[in-house]
């Protein structure tokens, strides 16, 4: 309840919240959970706490990890727990699923895309803005304070957005990307019983222990926008948000992407420092609309480590 | 600049529920708390609760707790405060104001009255 | 709960004349973790919402005229305001910004005689 997943680029500045909040008087102590150790409060250390922010200038993979947030209140301390995944920076121009912030809709009236997280950065204008990796070119669009506009929006627009920015801590600059994808809403349209992408009915998905695993439930319902149209995960038949283990958890963000022009939601499941005990659960991934609900299990098996060299 | 734009004046018969919704602009929404405080006519004001806007987890007054439902919604920068089985002591202003070091913003308050 | 007990209830004042508001809560406001009292000061007009005036028991927040100022710690405090001007008629409230439920005192109205 009281988790929040945070992911980030090797090099890329990343800067985290505390989930839980106070008041800016309150003293904010930060720990890396793993090992319990402080994390300091000097700037000239490449992680440090700042109140209730964490900053890695720059992000390391091995930075990856649980950190816990301690909001100390005059009455009692409030404890918030930051899951921060750094990976490595792709070779290709593909951004892949556990990078991607939540999915905006837009239409001819409203097509705004805001950055995600910049409020956290100190940044200064003008953002950079690129659609499947190229830089975004013509009067069409306009890079406006912290979001882009794009004039008459078409069909064709739909896409990943990435804005590019630099944040400045204390005259060193770092770079900093975040991507989203963008639908363009259709007027016209109909609803289906859910049909699940992913994972397949009954799939066994190979982790290894002590990784960091993603699993992702996708659906499509139907064509156009789609009301009360959702995808989620459950642990033994438990909402995760109930199931109560802060290294699983589900990305707040629903995405919503136009596949062949059918209306489709995908939620990514998070398991972080996969354990042996995960093996053992059942991994729901659920599609429900107006028409009903259709379920599809997972199961965990470990990956064989001779599979894994090979 | 901050600003809380809260939802108009409410007119309910006792037993029923009332939302009032409070639009925030100017900084950023999940940055800070939003509380709940009313004022009834010609007396002190009272605390609600409130709600972390980060992450969804509201406090509520003693007062109220099992009436009143406090919510958020990121998207729309908005926060919601729902009190139920209405009462004609419930009539009253009700403001949300943001939290911080004190309450610094408020919004314009909404009068909620109560009446068969 | 934190009580608040404000005195007066209502005063009446010559326009230029020093005020004192005093307000006393039920248990210390003061946190040892920083040292900083957790008590706030609003004004309020008829009709009009509540303007924070002073935090911390004493920091005035920007914009407030220099004539208020704010003093105490633990469990007693005081408003004052230097020299009373025929706008700062309204009512004032102390607020527990302590620790919940955060509760307000019962105000004193200021009046010009």
């Known amino acids: 309840k009281f988790s929040k997943q945070s992911w980030g680029l090797e090099n890329e500045a990343l800067i985290v919240r505390c989930p839980r909040q106070g008041k800016p008087s309150y003293t904010v102590d930060w720990y890396y959970s793993q090992t319990n150790k402080s994390i300091p409060t000097q700037e000239r250390n490449r992680v440090f706490a700042s109140g209730q922010l964490l900053k890695f200038l720059p992000a390391a993979v091995a930075d990856s990890g649980i950190y816990t947030c301690i909001v100390r209140s005059p009455t009692f301390n409030r404890t918030g727990y930051a899951n921060v995944t750094i990976y490595k920076k792709q070779s290709d121009c593909n951004v892949p699923d556990y990078l991607m912030y939540s999915t905006v809709s837009g239409s001819e009236k409203n097509s705004k895309i805001y950055c995600p997280t910049i409020d956290l950065y100190n940044w200064t204008a003008p953002l950079e803005w690129f659609k499947n990796c190229q830089a975004l070119q013509g009067s069409r669009y306009r890079a406006h304070k912290s979001f882009l506009v794009i004039d008459n929006v078409m069909t064709e627009d739909a896409g990943d957005y990435t804005c590019k920015f630099i944040h400045n801590e204390n005259g060193a600059n770092y770079s900093v990307t975040a991507t989203r994808s963008f639908t363009v809403k259709d007027e016209q349209g109909f609803s289906l019983f859910p049909v699940i992408g992913a994972p397949a009915q009954n799939e066994i998905k190979e982790v290894e222990i002590g990784k960091n695993a993603n699993l992702t439930c996708s659906a499509c319902f139907g064509k156009g926008t789609q009301f009360l149209a959702a995808v989620l995960w459950q642990l033994n038949g438990t909402k995760i948000t109930d199931f109560g283990e802060p290294r699983i958890q589900q990305e707040e963000g629903q995405n919503q992407s136009f596949s062949n022009g059918l209306a489709c939601l995908d939620m990514v499941l998070r398991i972080a420092d996969v354990k042996e005990e995960d093996l053992l659960l059942q991994y729901d991934c659920l599609a429900l609309n107006l028409h009903g609900l259709r379920r599809h299990t997972v199961r965990l098996s470990r990956k064989n480590p001779i599979d894994h060299h090979s | 600049q901050v600003q809380l734009v809260q939802s108009g004046a409410e007119v309910k018969k006792p037993g029923a529920s009332v939302k009032v919704s409070c639009k925030a602009s100017?900084?950023?929404?999940?940055?800070?708390?939003m509380n709940w405080v009313r004022q009834a006519p010609g007396q002190r004001l009272e605390w609600m609760g409130w709600?972390?806007?980060?992450?969804?987890?509201?406090t509520y007054g003693d007062n109220f707790k099992g009436r009143v439902t406090i919510t958020r919604d990121t998207s729309a920068s908005t926060a919601y405060m729902e009190l139920s089985s209405l009462r004609s002591e419930d009539t009253a202003v009700y403001y949300c104001?943001?939290?911080?070091?004190?309450?610094?913003?408020w919004g314009q308050g909404t009068l909620v009255t109560v009446s068969s | 709960d934190i009580q608040m007990t404000q005195s007066p209830s209502s005063l009446s004042a010559s326009v230029g004349d020093r005020v004192t508001i005093t307000c006393k809560s039920s248990?210390?406001?003061?946190?040892?973790?920083?040292?900083?009292?957790?008590l706030a000061w609003y004004q309020q007009k008829p009709g009009k919402v509540p303007k924070l005036l002073i935090y911390?028991?004493?920091t005035r927040e920007s914009g407030v005229p220099s004539r208020f100022s704010g003093s105490g710690s633990g469990t007693d405090f005081t408003l004052t305001i230097s020299s009373l001007q025929p706008e700062d008629v309204a009512t004032y409230y102390c607020?527990?910004?302590?620790?919940?439920?955060?509760?307000f005192g019962g105000g004193t109205k200021v009046e010009i005689k």
């Open positions: 104001a943001r939290e911080g070091d004190a309450f610094a913003y």
């Open positions: 100017g900084y950023t929404f999940i940055n800070y708390g």
């Open positions: 709600i972390n806007t980060y992450i969804g987890e509201p």
């Open positions: 248990q210390s406001l003061l946190y040892s973790g920083n040292q900083n009292n957790y």
């Open positions: 911390g028991a004493s």
């Open positions: 607020q527990n910004d302590h620790s919940y439920p955060y509760t």
